[in-house]
Protein backbone atom coordinates (compact mmCIF):
# COMPACT_ATOMS: atom_id res chain seq x y z
CA UNK A 1 0.00 0.00 0.00
CA UNK A 2 1.60 3.25 -1.14
CA UNK A 3 -0.85 5.44 0.75
CA UNK A 4 1.02 8.08 2.78
CA UNK A 5 1.10 7.07 6.46
CA UNK A 6 -0.68 9.70 8.57
CA UNK A 7 1.48 9.42 11.70
CA UNK A 8 4.90 11.09 11.74
CA UNK A 9 7.82 9.16 13.17
CA UNK A 10 11.22 10.28 14.45
CA UNK A 11 14.24 8.78 12.72
CA UNK A 12 18.00 8.70 12.97
CA UNK A 13 19.47 11.02 10.35
CA UNK A 14 22.95 10.33 9.00
CA UNK A 15 23.38 11.55 5.43
CA UNK A 16 24.55 14.62 3.53
CA UNK A 17 20.96 15.87 3.63
CA UNK A 18 20.52 16.04 7.40
CA UNK A 19 20.40 19.22 9.45
CA UNK A 20 20.74 17.34 12.73
CA UNK A 21 21.06 13.78 14.09
CA UNK A 22 17.32 13.16 13.89
CA UNK A 23 14.49 13.97 11.52
CA UNK A 24 10.73 13.55 11.33
CA UNK A 25 8.86 11.99 8.46
CA UNK A 26 6.21 9.51 7.43
CA UNK A 27 8.73 6.67 7.63
CA UNK A 28 12.40 6.04 8.34
CA UNK A 29 14.88 5.00 5.68
CA UNK A 30 18.20 3.20 5.47
CA UNK A 31 19.97 3.33 2.12
CA UNK A 32 23.08 1.35 1.29
CA UNK A 33 24.69 2.54 -1.92
CA UNK A 34 27.90 1.64 -3.68
CA UNK A 35 29.26 3.80 -6.46
CA UNK A 36 31.47 2.03 -8.96
CA UNK A 37 34.96 1.42 -7.60
CA UNK A 38 34.13 2.82 -4.16
CA UNK A 39 33.22 1.46 -0.74
CA UNK A 40 29.50 1.18 0.10
CA UNK A 41 28.03 4.01 2.14
CA UNK A 42 25.07 3.89 4.51
CA UNK A 43 22.61 6.79 4.74
CA UNK A 44 19.85 7.01 7.34
CA UNK A 45 17.00 9.48 7.20
CA UNK A 46 13.32 10.19 6.73
CA UNK A 47 10.85 9.65 3.94
CA UNK A 48 7.62 11.43 3.08
CA UNK A 49 7.55 11.26 -0.72
CA UNK A 50 8.23 8.61 -3.35
CA UNK A 51 7.26 5.67 -1.15
CA UNK A 52 7.64 3.38 -4.17
CA UNK A 53 11.37 3.47 -3.47
CA UNK A 54 10.64 1.36 -0.38
CA UNK A 55 9.51 -1.49 -2.62
CA UNK A 56 12.67 -1.68 -4.69
CA UNK A 57 14.59 -4.95 -4.62
CA UNK A 58 18.22 -4.86 -3.48
CA UNK A 59 20.74 -4.74 -6.31
CA UNK A 60 24.50 -4.89 -6.56
CA UNK A 61 24.60 -1.12 -6.10
CA UNK A 62 21.60 -0.15 -3.98
CA UNK A 63 19.45 -1.36 -1.11
CA UNK A 64 16.66 0.95 0.06
CA UNK A 65 14.93 -0.09 3.31
CA UNK A 66 11.95 1.62 4.93
CA UNK A 67 10.41 1.10 8.37
CA UNK A 68 7.59 2.76 10.21
CA UNK A 69 8.40 3.04 13.92
CA UNK A 70 10.35 5.83 15.62
CA UNK A 71 14.11 5.35 15.30
CA UNK A 72 13.57 1.97 13.66
CA UNK A 73 16.38 2.80 11.23
CA UNK A 74 19.01 3.31 13.93
CA UNK A 75 20.63 -0.12 14.00
CA UNK A 76 19.49 -1.66 10.72
CA UNK A 77 22.26 -3.30 8.67
CA UNK A 78 21.74 -3.87 4.96
CA UNK A 79 23.55 -5.93 2.36
CA UNK A 80 23.87 -5.60 -1.40
CA UNK A 81 22.97 -8.35 -3.83
CA UNK A 82 25.85 -10.17 -5.50
CA UNK A 83 24.51 -9.93 -9.06
CA UNK A 84 25.93 -9.22 -12.48
CA UNK A 85 26.61 -5.57 -13.25
CA UNK A 86 23.45 -3.96 -14.62
CA UNK A 87 23.72 -1.54 -17.52
CA UNK A 88 22.88 1.40 -15.30
CA UNK A 89 23.48 2.12 -11.65
CA UNK A 90 20.39 3.37 -9.81
CA UNK A 91 20.38 6.79 -8.22
CA UNK A 92 20.07 6.96 -4.44
CA UNK A 93 17.25 9.16 -3.20
CA UNK A 94 17.51 10.57 0.29
CA UNK A 95 14.83 12.73 1.83
CA UNK A 96 15.81 15.85 3.72
CA UNK A 97 14.18 16.16 7.11
Amino acid sequence: DLAKPSKLVNCTCESPHCKRPFCQGSWCTVVLVREQGRHPQVYRGCGSLNQELCLGRPTEFLNHHCCYRSFCNHNVSLMLEATQTPSEEPEVDAHLP
Epitope: H17, K19, R20
Partner: antibody
Framework: EVQLLESGGGLVQPGGSLRLSCAAS????????MSWVRQAPGKGLEWVAN????????NYVDSMRGRFTISRDNSKNTLYLQMNSLRAEDTAVYYC??????WGQGTLVTVTS | QSVLAQPPSASGTPGQRVTISCSGS????????VYWYQQLPGTAPKLLIY???KRPSGVPDRFSGSKSGTSASLAISGLRSEDEADYYC???????????FGGGTKLTVLG
Protein backbone atom coordinates in the same frame (compact mmCIF):
# COMPACT_ATOMS: atom_id res chain seq x y z
CA GLU B 1 25.66 11.93 -12.57
CA VAL B 2 24.12 14.78 -10.55
CA GLN B 3 24.07 18.02 -12.52
CA LEU B 4 22.75 21.47 -11.60
CA LEU B 5 22.82 24.17 -14.26
CA GLU B 6 21.95 27.74 -13.33
CA SER B 7 20.82 30.37 -15.83
CA GLY B 8 19.15 33.76 -15.91
CA GLY B 9 21.95 35.89 -14.48
CA GLY B 10 23.09 39.11 -16.09
CA LEU B 11 23.31 42.85 -15.79
CA VAL B 12 20.39 44.68 -14.21
CA GLN B 13 19.78 48.19 -12.90
CA PRO B 14 19.03 48.91 -9.22
CA GLY B 15 15.35 48.35 -8.54
CA GLY B 16 15.11 45.85 -11.38
CA SER B 17 14.15 42.18 -11.36
CA LEU B 18 15.65 38.89 -12.49
CA ARG B 19 14.48 35.31 -12.43
CA LEU B 20 17.14 32.66 -11.98
CA SER B 21 16.57 29.04 -13.01
CA CYS B 22 18.37 25.86 -12.06
CA ALA B 23 17.89 22.79 -14.24
CA ALA B 24 18.52 19.56 -12.33
CA SER B 25 19.37 16.17 -13.78
CA UNK B 26 20.88 12.84 -12.74
CA UNK B 27 18.69 12.40 -9.66
CA UNK B 28 15.05 12.33 -8.60
CA UNK B 29 14.56 16.08 -8.17
CA UNK B 30 11.30 15.74 -6.22
CA UNK B 31 13.07 13.79 -3.46
CA UNK B 32 15.37 16.59 -2.38
CA UNK B 33 15.18 19.95 -0.68
CA MET B 34 17.03 22.64 -2.64
CA SER B 35 18.79 25.91 -1.80
CA TRP B 36 20.15 29.07 -3.33
CA VAL B 37 23.48 30.33 -1.98
CA ARG B 38 25.31 33.44 -3.20
CA GLN B 39 28.87 34.71 -3.18
CA ALA B 40 29.72 38.36 -3.70
CA PRO B 41 32.97 39.00 -5.60
CA GLY B 42 35.93 38.18 -3.36
CA LYS B 43 33.64 37.39 -0.42
CA GLY B 44 32.35 34.31 1.39
CA LEU B 45 29.26 32.15 0.94
CA GLU B 46 25.84 33.46 2.00
CA TRP B 47 22.75 31.27 2.18
CA VAL B 48 19.76 32.89 0.45
CA ALA B 49 16.78 30.54 0.69
CA ASN B 50 15.66 26.94 0.63
CA UNK B 51 12.58 24.97 -0.31
CA UNK B 52 11.44 21.51 0.71
CA UNK B 53 10.70 18.62 -1.62
CA UNK B 54 7.13 19.52 -2.58
CA UNK B 55 7.48 23.29 -2.31
CA UNK B 56 5.24 23.65 0.72
CA UNK B 57 7.96 25.00 3.04
CA UNK B 58 10.30 27.88 2.26
CA ASN B 59 12.90 29.68 4.34
CA TYR B 60 14.73 32.92 3.58
CA VAL B 61 17.57 34.90 5.05
CA ASP B 62 16.06 37.98 6.74
CA SER B 63 17.72 40.54 4.48
CA MET B 64 16.13 39.02 1.36
CA ARG B 65 12.71 38.01 2.65
CA GLY B 66 10.01 39.94 0.77
CA ARG B 67 12.28 40.73 -2.19
CA PHE B 68 13.28 37.20 -3.21
CA THR B 69 10.98 34.23 -3.83
CA ILE B 70 12.13 30.63 -4.17
CA SER B 71 9.98 28.12 -6.02
CA ARG B 72 10.24 24.83 -7.87
CA ASP B 73 8.54 22.89 -10.64
CA ASN B 74 9.05 19.19 -10.01
CA SER B 75 7.51 18.29 -13.36
CA LYS B 76 10.29 20.27 -15.06
CA ASN B 77 13.07 19.37 -12.59
CA THR B 78 13.72 23.07 -12.15
CA LEU B 79 14.38 25.38 -9.21
CA TYR B 80 13.73 29.14 -9.44
CA LEU B 81 14.70 32.34 -7.64
CA GLN B 82 12.65 35.44 -8.42
CA MET B 83 14.60 38.52 -7.37
CA ASN B 84 12.87 41.90 -7.16
CA SER B 85 13.95 45.37 -6.02
CA LEU B 86 17.56 44.47 -6.68
CA ARG B 87 20.34 46.48 -5.04
CA ALA B 88 24.04 46.90 -5.78
CA GLU B 89 24.82 44.69 -2.79
CA ASP B 90 22.96 41.80 -4.44
CA THR B 91 25.77 41.56 -6.99
CA ALA B 92 27.11 38.01 -6.65
CA VAL B 93 27.44 34.59 -8.17
CA TYR B 94 24.25 32.70 -7.31
CA TYR B 95 24.60 28.96 -6.78
CA CYS B 96 21.83 26.40 -6.85
CA UNK B 97 22.52 23.57 -4.39
CA UNK B 98 20.96 20.24 -3.54
CA UNK B 99 20.86 20.26 0.23
CA UNK B 100 23.53 19.86 1.33
CA UNK B 101 25.86 18.14 -1.10
CA UNK B 102 25.93 19.11 -4.79
CA TRP B 103 26.29 22.64 -6.15
CA GLY B 104 25.92 24.09 -9.62
CA GLN B 105 28.63 26.22 -11.22
CA GLY B 106 26.71 29.42 -10.52
CA THR B 107 25.33 32.35 -12.51
CA LEU B 108 26.59 35.92 -12.11
CA VAL B 109 24.14 38.68 -11.23
CA THR B 110 25.46 42.24 -11.55
CA VAL B 111 23.37 45.13 -10.25
CA THR B 112 24.70 48.47 -11.42
CA SER B 113 23.47 51.73 -12.85
CA GLN C 1 30.16 39.50 9.91
CA SER C 2 29.53 35.77 9.60
CA VAL C 3 27.51 33.84 12.17
CA LEU C 4 30.19 31.12 12.31
CA ALA C 5 33.73 32.33 13.04
CA GLN C 6 36.70 31.00 11.10
CA PRO C 7 40.27 32.26 10.91
CA PRO C 8 40.71 34.16 7.64
CA SER C 9 43.89 32.32 6.72
CA ALA C 10 45.94 29.21 7.46
CA SER C 11 49.09 27.79 5.97
CA GLY C 12 51.36 24.78 6.00
CA THR C 13 54.04 23.00 4.05
CA PRO C 14 53.54 19.84 2.00
CA GLY C 15 53.14 16.79 4.24
CA GLN C 16 52.15 18.82 7.27
CA ARG C 17 48.89 18.61 9.23
CA VAL C 18 46.76 21.75 9.30
CA THR C 19 43.64 22.41 11.38
CA ILE C 20 40.95 25.00 10.65
CA SER C 21 38.55 25.98 13.44
CA CYS C 22 34.90 27.02 13.29
CA SER C 23 33.15 28.58 16.26
CA GLY C 24 29.40 28.99 16.63
CA SER C 25 26.66 28.93 19.24
CA UNK C 26 24.08 26.63 20.79
CA UNK C 27 21.54 27.40 18.07
CA UNK C 28 23.76 26.20 15.22
CA UNK C 29 26.85 24.06 15.85
CA UNK C 30 25.70 23.23 19.37
CA UNK C 31 22.55 21.47 18.21
CA UNK C 32 23.05 20.69 14.54
CA UNK C 33 25.47 19.00 12.17
CA VAL C 34 28.56 20.75 10.85
CA TYR C 35 29.49 20.65 7.17
CA TRP C 36 32.79 21.59 5.53
CA TYR C 37 33.20 22.73 1.92
CA GLN C 38 36.28 23.22 -0.22
CA GLN C 39 36.24 25.91 -2.89
CA LEU C 40 39.09 25.82 -5.37
CA PRO C 41 39.80 29.09 -7.20
CA GLY C 42 37.12 29.85 -9.78
CA THR C 43 34.98 26.81 -9.00
CA ALA C 44 31.83 25.95 -7.05
CA PRO C 45 32.10 24.68 -3.48
CA LYS C 46 32.55 20.93 -3.01
CA LEU C 47 31.31 18.98 0.00
CA LEU C 48 34.21 17.63 2.09
CA ILE C 49 32.61 16.66 5.40
CA TYR C 50 28.99 16.15 6.45
CA UNK C 51 27.41 15.16 9.74
CA UNK C 52 30.37 16.60 11.72
CA UNK C 53 32.85 13.90 10.71
CA LYS C 54 31.65 11.87 7.72
CA ARG C 55 33.28 11.96 4.30
CA PRO C 56 31.34 11.57 1.05
CA SER C 57 32.69 8.86 -1.21
CA GLY C 58 35.65 10.13 -3.19
CA VAL C 59 36.96 12.48 -0.50
CA PRO C 60 40.39 11.34 0.69
CA ASP C 61 40.76 10.24 4.30
CA ARG C 62 43.39 12.96 4.72
CA PHE C 63 40.38 15.19 5.47
CA SER C 64 38.67 14.73 8.82
CA GLY C 65 36.12 16.68 10.83
CA SER C 66 35.31 16.89 14.51
CA LYS C 67 32.91 18.77 16.74
CA SER C 68 32.86 19.60 20.44
CA GLY C 69 30.14 21.72 21.98
CA THR C 70 29.72 24.85 19.90
CA SER C 71 32.99 24.52 17.99
CA ALA C 72 34.17 22.35 15.13
CA SER C 73 37.38 21.78 13.25
CA LEU C 74 38.62 20.46 9.93
CA ALA C 75 41.98 18.69 9.87
CA ILE C 76 43.97 18.10 6.73
CA SER C 77 46.90 15.73 7.06
CA GLY C 78 49.61 15.05 4.51
CA LEU C 79 49.06 18.51 3.03
CA ARG C 80 49.33 18.74 -0.77
CA SER C 81 49.66 21.68 -3.12
CA GLU C 82 46.23 20.90 -4.59
CA ASP C 83 44.68 21.50 -1.14
CA GLU C 84 45.26 25.24 -1.59
CA ALA C 85 41.72 26.60 -1.54
CA ASP C 86 39.09 28.35 0.55
CA TYR C 87 37.41 26.23 3.23
CA TYR C 88 33.97 26.99 4.68
CA CYS C 89 32.11 25.53 7.62
CA UNK C 90 28.31 25.55 7.67
CA UNK C 91 25.42 24.49 9.89
CA UNK C 92 21.68 24.96 10.20
CA UNK C 93 20.71 27.67 12.71
CA UNK C 94 17.51 27.00 14.64
CA UNK C 95 17.12 30.63 15.77
CA UNK C 96 17.50 32.10 12.29
CA UNK C 97 15.71 29.13 10.70
CA UNK C 98 18.32 29.10 7.99
CA UNK C 99 21.75 27.91 6.98
CA UNK C 100 24.78 29.80 8.24
CA PHE C 101 28.34 29.76 6.93
CA GLY C 102 31.69 30.70 8.31
CA GLY C 103 33.53 33.54 6.65
CA GLY C 104 35.93 31.10 5.01
CA THR C 105 39.59 30.24 5.59
CA LYS C 106 42.11 30.66 2.78
CA LEU C 107 44.60 27.81 3.01
CA THR C 108 48.02 28.42 1.51
CA VAL C 109 50.43 25.56 0.88
CA LEU C 110 53.94 26.96 1.24
CA GLY C 111 56.96 25.93 -0.76
Amino acid sequence: EVQLLESGGGLVQPGGSLRLSCAASGFTFSSYAMSWVRQAPGKGLEWVANINQDGSEKNYVDSMRGRFTISRDNSKNTLYLQMNSLRAEDTAVYYCAREFDYWGQGTLVTVTS
Amino acid sequence: QSVLAQPPSASGTPGQRVTISCSGSSSNIGSNYVYWYQQLPGTAPKLLIYGNNKRPSGVPDRFSGSKSGTSASLAISGLRSEDEADYYCAAWDDSLNGRVFGGGTKLTVLG
